[in-house]
Interface confidence: low
């Protein structure tokens, strides 16, 4: 239904604390420089504002659509092209192209410190201070580094952290309570984070089919009991809803999100049984839990997918009258079927099927032609299969670290032009799907790997962009979502690469790394393992593994020497000698 | 070399309570998921329960799931599996292994009878 004034539309039914921090998180996301108290002070205006619209929907500019009003307060910003360049000449055009403009210039790789969480003591204090303003401290830190992230989502996390805070502030120990229940968030957020961008990407780049196509697939899995029209049902409403908040539209977002969450709790009984948990939850508690509830049992007697997809002789008319729908339920009864199943490899089986179909419905006995389609499916279940057993063997002989070592090794290989930084955060991402995701039961295990990497490889494919340097990359990243993961799979060593030359600094380091944290400090040493590969791609893993183990040896023993300097100064050359004589 | 070793197993009465405890040495423990297995009389290995490396994700087998609960301390290099409700088919070796292995240590025999 049309409403007389959209922002006191949304008011009302966010709530103002909602409102507020959807609008802050819009805000932190445009405009990714901005101080938190630049930004406070808008959505402070924009939330006066509202309310004046709340009380006379007739009132000035109260008829304004949300991009407009929005759009507005951002270019009235001081100093605007001082701080943003080109972003400035958003300003200089009418909705809707204006807002498409401020979208293109989202960062997602800006040059912002790493968010640093304070001491246990310092946090508490301001919590308890403003509560309210620590968590705008959070949503804006937090918005203005992932641009993408889902507004709702991220309500939620800090929803989360406010508990947290407010659980350990009260408590003796604030530091070990704090710290793993906030590792704990910050790494489900940034999960969060990558696979949101995925969802963005495939949006952006490919539209609202594939992005249904993508949610027919998961929406299938975890509703094996729902039929066709009710997963269809679904699939629209949550590509609405991501469509609105990948393009900037939060407050829509959240709302229809909300909406989404209510239709599924009051309608459960033909959706699934494992819903009432999550629907006893207040609303942003509610809708996460939606968002990743088990999968419910599988019907006992569904008949094999060859009846209705292979066997039947309308197989082709069924196809040409209307190929859409015909897909999209063979996609929902290949999917209820297999939640072993990742969602990229259930699209690609569904491609799979629709190239077949659209060449054997040309020709003269197309049952003879379609009839083998479901054993041509092999080879892709298959692959990934085997890519899930290999890395978690992997894993499993390595553990985390090594794991990551070890891809880093194999990815610096098959890119070594892509910057060591990328290269190294994609490393530790990637290898983190370890511990994510091989201590799964068995028919957990290939959906979680492939969906994870995917969602990783994305990020690696959004940075690249940017600055694109590897010709194998730009192959891999300019394909369908679906199958950069087998394409980044399949690379081998670059051998158009040129090494780089042997560059002592590079393999120099001082006593300051002996008071890092272990993260920091494993990101030193596997800088240094990409900066040696690049020197050396053909090196064997035997040979790296000797350099590391002295790299590591040398790290250890200076590290516990009395004199921390000198030890460095006078071991760090003989280091830098042997390295380079083990890899000759 | 890398070590597991399970304690806590014992005869219980249906309805009762054990917690089976895992020490783990060798290996840096804070670095790999871990689960639970059990193998009953003359069946085969079934897999119980497994938790991530830093103690954020567990999963159960629907068998198990709200009577046993999983937990790992990095520090103590310790995994613990709290079994309530216990049942007559929950008698078994209990074995802890490292991500989804195989295992490579004694067990803890759980007999669960009246």
């Known amino acids: 239904e049309a409403h007389k004034s959209e922002i006191a539309h949304r008011y009302n039914d966010l709530g103002e604390q909602h409102f507020k921090g959807l609008v802050l998180i819009a805000f932190s996301q445009y405009l990714q420089k901005c101080s938190y108290d630049e930004h406070a002070k808008l959505v402070q205006e924009v939330t006066d504002f509202a309310k004046t619209c709340v009380a006379d929907e007739s009132a000035a500019n109260c008829d304004k659509s949300l991009h407009t009003l929005f759009g507005d307060k951002l270019c009235a910003i001081p100093n605007l092209r001082e701080n943003y360049g080109e972003l400035a000449d958003c300003c200089t055009k009418q909705e809707p192209e204006r807002n498409e403009c401020f979208l293109q210039h989202k960062d997602d790789n800006p040059s912002l410190p790493p968010f640093e969480r304070p001491e246990a003591e310092a946090m508490c204090t301001s919590f308890k201070e403003n509560p309210t303003t620590f968590m705008g401290h959070y949503l804006h830190e937090v918005a203005r580094r992932h641009p993408y992230f889902y507004a709702p989502e991220l309500l939620y996390y800090a929803e989360q952290y406010n508990e947290i805070l407010t659980q350990c502030c009260a408590e003796a120990d604030k530091e070990s309570c704090l710290t793993p229940k906030l590792d704990g968030v910050k790494e489900k957020a940034l999960v969060s984070s990558v696979r949101q961008r995925m969802k963005c990407s495939s949006m952006q780049k490919f539209g609202e089919r594939a992005f249904k196509a993508w949610a027919v697939a998961r929406l299938s899995q975890t509703f094996p009991n729902a039929d066709f029209a009710e997963i269809t049902k679904l699939a629209t409403d949550l590509t609405k809803v991501n469509k609105e908040c990948c393009h900037g539209d939060l407050l829509e977002c959240a709302d229809d999100r909300a909406e989404l969450a209510k239709y599924m709790c009051e309608n459960q009984a033909t959706i699934s049984s494992k819903l009432q948990t999550c629907c006893d939850k207040p609303l942003l508690k509610k809708a996460h839990c939606l968002s990743e509830v088990e999968h419910d049992t599988m019907p006992a007697d569904l008949p094999a997918i060859a009846a209705d997809f292979v066997e039947d002789q309308e197989v082709c008319k069924n196809y040409a009258e209307a190929k859409d729908v015909f897909l999209g339920t063979f996609l929902y009864e290949y999917s209820r079927r297999h939640p072993d199943y990742s969602v990229s490899l259930l699209l690609r089986l569904a491609k799979k099927y629709e190239a077949t179909l659209e060449k054997c419905c040309a020709e003269a006995n197309p049952p003879a032609c379609y009839g083998t389609v479901l054993a041509e499916f092999q080879p892709l279940v298959e692959e990934p299969k085997n890519l899930v057993k290999t890395n978690c063997d992997l894993y499993e002989k390595l553990g985390e670290y090594g794991f990551q070592n070890a891809i880093l090794v194999r990815y610096t290989q098959k890119a070594p032009q892509v910057s060591t930084p990328t290269l190294v955060e994609a490393a530790r991402n990637l290898g983190r799907v370890g511990t994510k995701c091989c201590t799964l039961p068995e028919d957990q295990r290939l959906p979680c790997v492939e969906d994870y990497l995917s969602a990783i490889l994305n990020r690696v494919c959004l940075l690249h962009e940017k600055t694109p340097v590897s010709e194998h990359v730009t192959k891999c990243c300019s394909g369908s979502l679906v199958e950069r993961r087998p394409c980044f799979s399949a690379l081998t060593v670059d051998e158009t690469y040129v090494p780089k030359e042997f560059k002592a600094e590079t393999f120099t380091f001082h006593s300051d790394i002996c008071t890092l944290p272990e993260k920091e400090k494993q990101i030193k040493k596997q800088t240094a393992l990409a900066e040696l590969v690049k020197h050396k791609p053909k090196a064997t893993a035997e040979q790296l593994k000797t350099v590391m183990d002295d790299f590591a040896q040398f790290l250890d023993t200076c590290c516990k020497a009395a004199d921390k300097d000198t030890c460095f100064s006078t071991e760090g050359p003989n280091l830098v000698t042997r390295c380079k004589d083990a890899l000759a | 070399q890398v070590q597991l070793q399970e304690s806590g197993g014992g005869l219980v009465q249906p309805g009762g309570s054990l917690r089976l405890t895992c020490t783990a040495s060798?290996?840096?423990?804070?670095?790999?998921?871990m689960s639970w297995v059990r193998q009953a009389p003359g069946k085969g290995l079934e897999w119980v329960s497994a938790?991530?490396?830093?103690?954020?994700?567990?999963r159960y087998a629907d068998s198990v799931k709200g009577r046993f609960t999983i937990s790992r301390d990095n520090g103590k290099k310790m995994l613990t599996l709290d079994m309530n409700s216990l049942k007559p088919e929950d008698t078994a070796v209990y074995y802890c292994?490292?991500?989804?292995?195989?295992?490579a240590s004694q067990g803890t025999q759980v007999t669960v009878s009246s």
């Open positions: 292994v490292i991500g989804r292995g195989s295992p």
């Open positions: 060798g290996f840096t423990f804070r670095s790999f998921g």
């Open positions: 938790i991530s490396a830093d103690g954020s994700d567990k």
